[in-house]
């Protein structure tokens, strides 16, 4: 960053997205400001509008092309400028030589469902957006249900530590709603983080069967 | 990369308004900050106005500000130029330019353009 009071962090989707975030303090909120990517060994440049988040951070989305088009490589390096406008002028305000796999952070997965349902187990599936084919199978999954009564930061975590878009629940309660959330995070990358959680897949156990224990 | 197609030029009298249109094809569509430009017969092509790709922020060359504006729906895929008390040195032919390098989009030579459309004001 040019300056102590400023942090500006990015991660790429591993195909064609980076997100920044950029804070500063006592930064305007009404100043015009864009990310600007300068790859080393591309022919595009790009830019994005960052909109404000909170009181003194901001957000935008370099969209490098289609959803599933795989804009960089791991011998790529972008370098991402922050520039605000002063005046007439335009201020280089943070800048970082970004190298796309050392800072990976794959979309939510999606396409939850539900497999199939019994009263004491549940098998889900889903499926990884817009993630490298360069992954081939090195990539981890966490997971987490939602019981009655409690909440997301009070489920264990279960860890799947291969490629496996799918888990069989067990030990569950009959005649039950639960909640289920699933991340997703390559091996790839030393500043590499987990994506954000899938939206919550809600499904119910079946009711045990009259006159069993 | 991205085809850009401009509509909605004509003949007015000045102090008339015109709305143009330019629809934005093959690629996706909010990378690009979008500008118009024009030339008059025998003048060189000019700046008009652009609008960032989140539509937040919107330049003007000075000679149309307050009667124009500039605008996009990124879910239509178009941008717009709202012409408004148009007067007789507004007559020029009309182009959109796409660039996803905002710095770069009164680049004439870098820009991706349409095929413009003709704007005449009439006294």
């Known amino acids: 960053a040019v300056n102590g009071t400023s942090r500006f962090t990015c991660f790429y989707n591993s195909r064609a997205n980076i997100s920044c975030v950029w804070s500063q303090d006592g930064a305007l909120q009404d100043t015009s400001c864009q990310v600007h990517a300068w790859p080393d060994r591309r022919r595009w440049n790009q830019t994005c509008e960052l909109l404000p988040v909170s009181q003194a951070s901001w957000a935008c989305n370099l969209i490098l092309g289609t959803p599933d088009s795989q804009k960089l490589t791991a011998v790529d390096i972008v370098t991402l400028r922050v520039m605000c406008r002063e005046g007439v002028r335009w201020r280089m305000m943070a800048i970082q030589d970004f190298k796309p796999f050392e800072n990976l952070r794959l979309m939510a997965p999606i396409s939850l469902q539900v497999v199939h349902v019994e009263t004491h187990r549940c098998n889900i599936s889903w499926k990884i957006s817009q993630a490298s084919h360069y992954f081939e199978r090195h990539l981890e999954f966490e997971a987490r249900t939602l019981s009655p009564g409690h909440t997301w930061e009070e489920a264990p975590l279960m860890t799947l530590k291969q490629k496996q878009e799918w888990i069989c629940l067990e030990t569950l309660t009959p005649d039950t709603q639960y909640e289920f959330q699933v991340r997703v995070k390559p091996l790839q990358g030393e500043f590499t983080t987990w994506s954000p959680w899938s939206q919550p897949l809600a499904f119910r156990t079946k009711p045990a069967a009259l006159g069993k224990d | 990369q991205v085809q850009l197609q401009e509509s909605g030029g004509g003949l007015v009298q000045a102090g008339g308004s015109l709305r143009l249109s330019c629809a934005a094809s093959?690629?996706?569509?909010?990378?690009?900050?979008m500008a118009w430009f024009r030339q008059a017969p025998g003048k060189e092509r000019e700046f008009v106005a652009s609008?960032?790709?989140?539509?937040?922020?919107?330049e003007y060359v000075d000679s149309v500000k307050g009667r124009f504006t500039v605008s996009r729906d990124n879910a239509k895929n178009t941008a717009y130029l709202q012409m408004n008390n148009l007067k007789p040195e507004d007559t020029a032919i009309y182009y959109c330019?796409?660039?996803?390098?905002?710095?770069?989009?009164?680049?004439?030579?870098?820009?991706?353009w349409g095929q413009g459309t003709q704007v005449t004001v009439s006294s």
């Open positions: 093959g690629d996706v569509f909010v990378r690009y900050t």
């Open positions: 330019a796409a660039n996803t390098d905002y710095f770069q989009i009164r680049s004439l030579d870098l820009n991706t």
């Open positions: 609008v960032t790709d989140s539509g937040r922020t919107t």
